[in-house]
């Protein structure tokens, strides 16, 4: 015998108190699939959470975070404090990156500057708390008598002779 509840569409529930008739979900609740015997309570986006999508009879509300915070976890289950660039979030709040490290985002950890010498290159631009170092040509390329670094010639389009 077919379950009469299987005919109840999303947005309704199978009401046992009313001979298994399909009743609409009450306010502030939803059912996202058919054949449900109860509707789920809508998520409330309170406090630091703000409503990205309102709850409907067939889908839950979706939250994100108020400015100054960012989402963490599945479905934005948490809001974590943003820091400034050049900082990282610690147990005691936002702290400046230590010398030799940087963070160019409002979240995440401070990362060590690139070690240019590992690639046989020199430091072209020093690092800061907010920016990584910029590596330049290798020291050998900069030694006296070495040819200066010149940009490559632009590629010529076919069929065009040089000016």
């Amino acid at each position: 015998l077919q379950d009469p509840c299987s005919n109840c569409p999303a947005g309704t529930f199978c009401d046992n108190n009313r001979n298994q008739i399909c009743s609409p979900c009450p306010p502030n609740s939803f059912s996202s699939a058919g054949g449900q015997r109860t509707c789920d309570i809508c998520r409330q986006c309170k406090g630091v959470f703000r409503t990205r999508k309102e709850c409907s009879s067939t889908s839950n509300a979706e939250c994100d975070c108020t400015p100054g915070f960012h989402c963490l976890g599945a479905g934005c289950s948490m809001c974590e404090q943003d820091c400034k660039q050049g900082q990282e979030l610690t147990k005691k709040g936002c702290k400046d990156c230590c010398f030799g490290t940087f963070n160019d985002q409002k979240r995440g950890i401070c990362r060590p500057w690139t070690n240019c010498s590992l690639d046989g290159k020199s430091v072209l631009v020093n690092g800061t708390k907010e920016r990584d170092v910029v590596c330049g040509p290798s020291p050998a390329d900069l030694s006296p008598g070495a040819s200066s670094v010149t940009p490559p010639a632009p590629a010529r389009e076919p069929g065009h002779s040089p000016q």
Epitope: V48, C63, C79, E80, Q81
Partner: nanobody
Amino acid sequence: QVQLQESGGGLVQPGGSLRLSCAASGFTFDDYAIGWFRQAPGKEREGVLCISSSGGSTYYADSVKGRFTISRDNAKNTVYLQMTNLKPEDTAVYLCGAPRDCSRYSSDDYWGQGTQVTVSS
């Protein structure tokens, strides 16, 4: 049951002071941080200040540094937001929340309903 209740709001002239209270009940107050947020008409909600369970302060808004301070009285299960040199742009509904940690809020944290602060001459 769990409750957070804000009080102390009202109408104050520019340059004046107010002290808001956030009274908690129904949970182990000492284990939780308390954060203050505010929402001005037609604007996004913004974080103001937070106090950790151990008493350390975290400023969320640079605009209140030097004017607002936060303290807690664990014996009274209450956190206080002392606001001085108030400006018209501080006008908002102020509400408190109780996360475990000032830097991270969960969707099941407790929140109050808010208290209105109006700064106007």
